[in-house]
Interface confidence: low
C-alpha cells in the first residue's frame, strides 16, 4: 500500500541517521584518547587512600570497580541500554550541542559489609548497599 | 580517646578533601561553560525529527527529558547518589586522570504508550518501558 511504501521509505531515510554517533564520539576526543564502548573497569579502593583507615577496621579496601566508556550508536545488547538511552542517542546525533549522549553508569551494584568505629568508639558491623559495580550500561 | 581523636581528625581531613571537587569541577570547563549540578532537563522528542512519522501513528512525540550536569563532591541529597558514586568522587579527586567522576543518569523512568504500524502494516498499541526521565542522579 502507499502507506506501507511511505513507511518503508521513511525507514530507508532513517537508515542513515544513527551511526553518526560513532563519528561524533571520535571527534569528542583527541585520537590519542579515543574512548572504548561503555563497560566495567576494575578498581580497587583502599580505605587508607581515602583517609578512612582509622575508623574502618575491616576490610582494608574492596574491589569497587567503575563504569566508563562511550554510549554511541548503535547501542548493542551488551550495553544494557534503556529505551530512553536509545532515543537520546538519536536526538544527540541531530543536536549534539544541545543534548548529550547517554552516560555509562552502573546497572548492577552489590553490597559489602564493613566493620567500623562509630562516633562513640563502638565497633559496628554494617552492610552498605550499592558499593560494588557488577555491570554497566548506557543510561 | 586517642583513637577517636584520630578518627575525628581523619574525618575532618576527608571533609576538606571532598569540597575540593567543587573547585575541580569549575576548572574542568571554561568559565563560559560551567556545568550546573546533575539534574533533569526538559526535552520534547518529535518522532518526525527522528524520521519515524510514517510508522508511528500516535503520539506525534513525547516529553522524553534527559539528565545532565556535574557529579562533583559533595554529592548533595538531591543528587540521589549511590554509595558507590560517593566513593568514586573521592577516588576521582585523588586520581582525576585515572577514574572519572560519576555520571548524571536517570534514576526514575516512566513508560509511554505508542500506536504504530508493524512490518505487516498491522496497527499495534504497545506500552514501552523506560521512555520518560522522571528523575536524575549521580551514579
Amino acid at each position: 500500500s502507499a502507506s506501507s511504501r511511505r513507511r518503508q521509505q521513511s525507514r530507508n531515510r532513517s537508515t542513515q541517521s544513527q551511526d553518526v554517533a560513532r563519528v561524533s564520539s571520535a571527534s569528542d576526543y583527541n585520537s590519542s584518547e579515543l574512548k572504548t564502548a561503555c563497560r566495567k573497569h576494575e578498581l580497587y579502593v583502599s580505605f587508607q587512600d581515602l583517609g578512612w583507615q582509622d575508623w574502618i577496621i575491616a576490610p582494608k579496601g574492596y574491589a569497587a570497580n567503575y563504569c566508563d566508556g562511550e554510549c554511541s550508536f548503535p547501542l548493542n545488547a551488551h550495553m544494557n541500554a534503556t529505551n530512553h538511552a536509545i532515543v537520546q542517542t538519536l536526538v544527540h546525533l541531530m543536536n549534539p550541542e544541545y543534548v548529550p549522549k547517554p552516560c555509562c553508569a552502573p546497572t548492577k551494584l552489590n553490597a559489602i559489609s564493613v566493620l567500623y568505629f562509630d562516633d562513640n568508639s563502638n565497633v559496628i558491623l554494617k552492610k552498605y548497599r550499592n558499593m560494588v559495580v557488577r555491570a554497566c550500561g548506557c543510561h | 580517646s586517642a583513637s577517636s581523636r584520630r578518627r575525628q581528625q581523619s574525618r575532618n581531613r576527608s571533609t576538606q578533601s571532598q569540597d575540593v571537587a567543587r573547585v575541580s569541577s569549575a576548572s574542568d570547563y571554561n568559565s563560559s561553560e560551567l556545568k550546573t549540578a546533575c539534574r533533569k532537563h526538559e526535552l520534547y522528542v518529535s518522532f518526525q525529527d527522528l524520521g519515524w512519522q510514517d510508522w508511528i501513528i500516535a503520539p506525534k512525540g513525547y516529553a522524553a527529558n534527559y539528565c545532565d550536569g556535574e557529579c562533583s563532591f559533595p554529592l548533595n541529597a538531591h543528587m540521589n547518589a549511590t554509595n558507590h558514586a560517593i566513593v568514586q568522587t573521592l577516588v576521582h579527586l585523588m586520581n582525576p586522570e585515572y577514574v572519572p567522576k560519576p555520571c548524571c543518569a536517570p534514576t526514575k523512568l516512566n513508560a509511554i504508550s505508542v500506536l504504530y504500524f508493524d512490518d505487516n502494516s498491522n496497527v499495534i498499541l504497545k506500552k514501552y518501558r523506560n521512555m520518560v526521565v522522571r528523575a536524575c542522579g549521580c551514579h
Epitope: P74 | W55, Y116
Partner: nanobody, 124 residues
Framework: EVQLVESGGGFVQAGGSLRLSCAAS????????MGWYRQAPGKQRELVAA???????NYADSVKGRFTISRDNAKNTLYLQMNSLKPEDTAVYYC???????????WGSGNDYWGQGTQVTVSS
Amino acid sequence: EVQLVESGGGFVQAGGSLRLSCAASGSIFSINAMGWYRQAPGKQRELVAAITSGGSTNYADSVKGRFTISRDNAKNTLYLQMNSLKPEDTAVYYCSAVTILLTSGGWGSGNDYWGQGTQVTVSS
C-alpha cells in the same frame, strides 16, 4: 537479515581518488543507519563517515574535506567518494547498517550488519 556488498576499492597513488559503493539488500526497510568504517592493519576499526535521516552528514576529523558520503535510496546504495587520498587512508573499508525497530520487545537497537570489506591501498 540485511546483506551488504561493497565495491570500488583498489590501488591508487597519493592524491588520487576512489569511489566506494555499498549495495544493500534483504530487509532493508528495517535499516536505520549506515556508515563507512575502515580498519588498518594492527588498528581498531573506526568510523569514517555516516549520513543522517535528513541527509546531513558527519565525518571523522581525519577525512573532513576530502571524503563525501552519499546515498541513493532508489538503488539502496551507499557511496563514499574519497579524494586527495593519503597513504594513511590505506585500510579495509567496510559498509555498516544498523537496525532499530519498534518491536514487541522494545526499542530494539541490537543489530548491526557488515559487508565483507573492500581493500583500499594508497601508495606514496
